[in-house]
């Protein structure tokens, strides 16, 4: 056993190169210096190591850095990142956006893994808030990222970051999340003129209160039915038939197709039949 763990003569690795793919697991363990591995991590990804060999390399790094890897090593982990557990990642202190991007690239095209979720959580907590550049990066890799956060986590998003949010990033957000994001969006876009403001705020309107919808109805915005269907039920109910007609403009005819669905159904039920009849759509309250 002692002989087996000693590095055979002439096999001591002087650098991380392709010759190492022919090393058995025990040889890698015995002949590759952990410090050398740490300084030449960028070379590991260019070498077609087996999963078993990568396990050995990870073990060596774990022994060298029992308290967690330094960022200089983390940034160059590449495919070795896939070998990390959430427990490993919780020991890290990742502060560079470049490091985050490099690791997200490894997982690109896959669902968000527990490892990636932990990495993002560590990174965002380290920064103290979700700044615009971070949000840009995260939503580029994971369009549903924003909607995976709890309302409490979303409260740390500064209004300035809202500029990075695209409509598709909000597709899976629920009303509680939009309740948090809408006031931030309103603040972020407050200096825009009417039509430009509506284009930007539209995706966030699922968190808008009644008074803001009433205000929008006075601005000829022509809200589409898809947006109307995402509005908060409690915000829609107090709107009058005239206000909904103004809010939707030419899209008001779409109410007929949605009359069995919420929130349209709830709104129709609470209107006077005489008022509904003015729309000429055959809606029954």
């Amino acid at each position: 056993e002692v002989e087996k763990t000693a590095c055979p003569s002439g096999k001591k690795a002087r650098e991380i190169d392709e010759s190492l793919i022919f090393y058995k697991k025990w040889e890698l363990e015995a002949c590759v210096d952990a410090a050398l591995l740490a300084t030449q991590m960028d070379r590991v990804n260019a070498i077609p190591f087996t999963y078993e060999q990568l396990d050995v390399l990870k073990h060596k790094l774990d022994e060298l850095y029992p308290q967690g890897y330094p960022e200089s090593v983390i940034q160059h982990l590449g495919y070795l990142f896939l070998k990390m557990s959430p427990e490993d990642i919780r020991k890290w202190n990742v502060t560079s956006l470049e490091t985050l991007k490099a690791l997200l690239e490894v997982n690109k095209g896959h669902e968000m893994s527990p490892q990636v979720a932990t990495l993002i959580d560590r990174f965002v907590k380290g920064r103290g808030q979700l700044d615009k550049d971070t949000l840009d990066t995260l939503t580029a890799f994971y369009p549903g990222y924003l909607c995976s956060l709890s309302p409490e986590e979303l409260s740390s998003v500064p209004p300035s970051s809202i500029w990075a949010v695209r409509p598709q990033d909000l597709d899976t957000c629920d009303p509680r999340q939009l309740d948090v994001l809408y006031p931030k969006a309103r603040l972020a876009f407050q200096n825009m003129n009417g039509s430009e403001y509506f284009v930007k705020i539209q995706s966030f309107l699922g968190g808008a209160p009644t008074e803001d919808l009433k205000a929008l109805s006075q601005q000829n915005v022509s809200m589409d039915l898809a947006t109307f269907m995402k509005l908060r039920t409690d915000a829609v109910l107090p709107l009058t038939v005239a206000e909904v007609q103004k809010l939707l403009g030419p899209h008001v005819e779409g109410l007929k197709a949605e009359e069995r669905h919420r929130p349209v159904r709830d709104w129709i039920l609470r209107q006077r039949q005489d008022d509904l009849d003015t729309l000429g759509l055959g809606l029954q309250g």
């Epitope: 629920d174 009303p175 039920t233 109910l237 069995r260 669905h261 919420r262 039920l269 309250g285």
Partner: antibody, heavy 119, light 107 residues
Framework: QVQLQESGPGLVKPSETLSLTCTVS??????????WSWIRQPPGKGLEWIGY???????NYNPSLKSRVTISVDTSKNQFSLKLSSVTAADTAVYYC???????????WGQGTMVTVSS | DIQMTQSPSSLSASVGDRVTITCRAS??????VNWYQQKPGKAPKLLIY???SLQSGVPSRFSGSGSGTDFTLTISSLQPEDFATYYC?????????FGGGTKVEIK
């Protein structure tokens, strides 16, 4: 605290009409935010929504029961009622009345009343 | 009508277990899905509304998630009083429908 109480006969003959009433206490049947539903549960089976009514009298029924169901409201008595015609043994169930709060769901239920259809 | 398919129909679990029940809608129900708990001889009780909002007075070990067609009810740490039957229900379409129920039994 809003409470609901179902009342009506526990035994109905086949082909006759089942009639139940739900009395609302501690709140108003004329609430802007609420609709009032009937839901049933055959013995050992799951829940089936029958229909709802709004205080204005507007109703909405389960399509599979629509031809036999009538739900009405009496705002002066703070009650709403269910009539189910041409009953068969398949209509034997526990019948519940429930409040459907527009912002949540069936948040308040009656304790349920067992109705058996048998000759 | 929107059909709600619940799975599993029954499960056995121990106190302290994490339990997950899923509900699939035959077409999008947006986030208009509610979850109820029913114990034998009792009326159902609302646990979760609008897919993920916890009804007042319901313990925080209950949580809901999902939107569109796939919804989940999770009990983070099963307690003795949680052994019951659970139902999902959609209210997006005017014809409300319930799932078939999931009976959670003691292992």
């Amino acid at each position: 605290q809003v409470q609901l109480q179902e009342s009506g006969p526990g035994l109905v003959k086949p082909s006759e009409t089942l009639s139940l009433t739900c009395t609302v206490s501690g709140g108003s049947v004329s609430s802007f935010t609420d609709t009032w539903s009937w839901i049933r549960q055959p013995p050992g089976k799951g829940l089936e929504w029958i229909g709802y009514i709004y205080y204005s009298g507007s109703t909405n029924y389960n399509p599979s029961l629509k031809s036999r169901v009538t739900i009405s409201v009496d705002t002066s008595k703070n009650q709403f009622s269910l009539k189910l015609s041409s009953v068969t043994a398949a209509d034997t169930a526990v019948y519940y009345c429930a409040r459907d709060f527009v912002l949540s769901g069936f948040d308040i239920w009656g304790q349920g009343t067992m109705v058996t259809v048998s000759s | 009508d929107i059909q709600m398919t619940q799975s599993p129909s029954s499960l056995s679990a121990s106190v302290g277990d994490r339990v997950t029940i899923t509900c699939r809608a035959s077409q999008s129900s947006r986030y208009y899905v509610n979850w109820y708990q029913q114990k034998p001889g009792k009326a159902p009780k609302l646990l979760i509304y609008a897919a993920s909002s916890l009804q007042s007075g319901v313990p925080s070990r209950f949580s809901g998630s999902g939107s569109g067609t796939d919804f989940t009810l999770t009990i983070s740490s099963l307690q003795p009083e949680d052994f019951a039957t659970y139902y999902c229900q959609q209210s997006y379409d005017a014809s409300y429908t319930f799932g078939g129920g999931t009976k959670v039994e003691i292992k």
